[in-house]
């Protein structure tokens, strides 16, 4: 059979190869397509409801006036010539639309080096077959799941045109000390061949580094963190961001109602007072970030305090020195 | 929403002429064939005629060829049928009917409009 | 031309019956037939297109099937509303043939 494509919504003619060129004629069209269960026979005589997909025209071709999804299939023409020859024509018909150019949509202006951000989603409308979506960093492909690019696809079906939507949402991890303007495109890949890409435009969002934070110091004094009953603990909180973060405190686990303040002072210590402290430095551009724990206890006479404090990661339910 | 309005219908006399409109809204008139369907008083249905969306193809059954023409004004959103040499027969309501072809045949109906044919 | 042969031509029913109504195509016409309802006095309405695909706004009560070039309109439990003259229509080929219609009337 000889293959045919041909877009959606235009005309076609297909040749009924060996028929006299005007009537009478002695020719059958038969067609096997999404119209059809098995086979449909259209004469030059005919006319009729099939007109508006499939007619024959006077030279014998068959002329479809506006092809559609439906009209995919198997072609065939068996014609006699005046001599009493038989030719037979066979043609396989595949349809295709291409989409509006795609677009990049909900884009991001600025992306974080070191972690996962979503670049953007690429929407195609309108294609048939559905073809495919690719992203390209600085012109070169993007290879899903390598190098910290990850891509989330989606492809729906008009429930009247059964023409495709294909989404593509990027995610990427942008290399620390990398390009800080990256350009990134997004292209649809037509499903039949011998049609080039459509691109979209490209965006630039910007890289921020983020500084790496310096630990939140917790200093205990008395040093280690064990007085004696009706004592003073000092905690200080020291953090060498700039500006000066707020400075909130726990204790077990749980927030002190109190004002922000990098001192913490617990005058005449009693036994309510023992637990393990940390403080919390809220950052307006990185968020919390939490203190090692220290655990405060008293010291009855006669029993030797410990020489240290607690020591624990960032957050509580650590060791305590008792 | 979609609509379909015949008018036109009436008393006529045997052998004498009448022209039925149908003025369409609420969709995209010349995507679609039409189709005039009749019904006479009591019986079944009948196909009476259908035109392609441009007009340039009409269909009749042979009860009517040669003597009734349906026609359309895609400008004016409207659909015509012109019946000569009427007979007694020919006595039915009439509808205009959206579609006709295999991709949408008579989704839609009018109201129907009654011609009369009698002396 | 192609014959549409309807049957039964009138039934009685009750409210909450299965009903069943038969079109029987002269030669083969592929999916194109649909079903019509129709009351006195007023236009026919479309129930069933391409043999057996609801259309809008159609209760699912209704429905179609076919096999070779028998078509098939089944009501599973007949409403009030229901009462009417039922028709099928024939539209792969011209001329576009109607069955005979199918009065269902209450017991």
């Known amino acids: 059979a000889q293959n045919i494509t041909a877009r959606i919504g235009e005309p076609l003619v297909l040749k009924c190869k060996g028929a006299p060129k005007k009537p009478p004629q002695r020719l059958e069209w038969k067609l096997n397509t999404g119209r059809t269960e098995a086979w449909k026979v259209l004469s030059p005589q005919g006319g009729g409801p099939w007109d508006s997909v499939a007619r024959v025209l006077p030279n014998g071709s068959l002329f479809l006036p506006a092809v559609g999804i439906q009209d995919e299939g198997i072609f065939r023409c068996q014609a006699m010539n005046r001599n009493g020859k038989e030719t037979k024509s066979n043609y396989r018909v595949r349809v295709y639309q291409i989409p509006g150019k795609p677009e990049i949509v909900d884009s991001a202006s600025e992306l974080t080096a070191g972690v996962p951000n979503k670049v953007g989603t690429c929407v195609s409308e309108g294609s048939y077959p559905a073809g495919t979506l690719s992203w390209h960093l600085d012109g070169k492909p993007l290879v899903p799941n390598e190098k910290g690019v990850s891509v989330k696809e989606q492809t729906r079906r008009h429930p009247e045109t059964g023409l495709f939507t294909l989404q593509s949402e990027l995610m990427v991890t942008p290399a620390r000390g990398g390009d800080p303007r990256p350009t990134f495109s997004c292209s649809f890949s037509p499903g039949l061949p011998r049609h080039r890409a459509l691109r979209t435009a490209p965006i630039q969002p910007r890289v921020w580094e983020p500084v790496p934070l310096e630990e939140v110091q917790l200093v205990v004094e008395p040093e280690g963190g064990a007085v004696a009953p009706g004592g003073t603990v000092t905690l200080t909180c020291e953090v060498p961001a700039q500006p000066s973060p707020q400075i909130h405190w726990m204790k077990d686990g749980v927030p002190l109602p109190l004002p922000p303040s990098p001192v913490l002072i617990l005058p005449e210590i009693g036994p309510q007072d023992q637990g393990t402290y940390s403080c919390v430095a809220t950052h307006s551009s990185h968020g919390p970030q939490e203190s090692r724990a220290v655990s405060i206890s008293i010291i009855e006479p006669g029993e030797e305090g410990p020489t240290a404090g607690s020591v624990g990661g960032s957050g509580l339910g650590t060791l305590a020195l008792a | 929403e979609v609509q379909l309005v015949e008018s036109g219908g009436g008393l006529v006399q045997p052998g004498g002429s009448l022209r039925l409109s149908c003025a369409a809204s609420?969709?995209?008139?010349?995507?679609?064939?039409m189709t005039w369907v009749r019904q006479a008083p009591g019986k079944g249905l009948e196909w009476v005629a259908s035109i392609d969306n441009s007009g340039d193809n009409t269909y009749y059954p042979d009860s009517v060829k040669d003597r009734f023409t349906i026609s359309r004004d895609n400008a004016k959103n409207s659909l015509y049928l012109q019946m000569n040499s009427l007979r007694a027969e020919d006595t039915a309501v009439y509808y205009c009917?959206?579609?006709?072809?295999?991709?949408?045949?008579?989704?839609?109906w009018g109201q129907g409009t009654l011609v009369t044919v009698s002396s | 031309d192609i014959q549409m042969t309807q049957s039964p031509s009138s039934l009685s029913a009750s409210v909450g019956d299965r009903v069943t109504i038969t079109c029987r195509a002269s030669q083969d016409v592929g999916i194109y037939v649909n079903w019509f309802q129709q009351k006195p006095g007023k236009a026919p309405r479309r129930l069933i297109y391409r043999a057996t695909n609801l259309a809008d706004g159609v209760p699912s009560r209704f429905s179609g099937s076919r096999s070779g070039t028998d078509f098939t309109l089944t009501i599973s439990s007949l409403q009030p509303e229901d009462f009417a003259t039922y028709y099928c229509l024939e539209f792969d080929e011209h001329p576009l043939t109607f069955g005979g219609g199918t009065k269902v009337e209450i017991k």
């Open positions: 009917a959206r579609g006709g072809d295999i991709k949408v045949s008579l989704d839609r």
């Open positions: 609420g969709f995209t008139f010349n995507n679609y064939w």
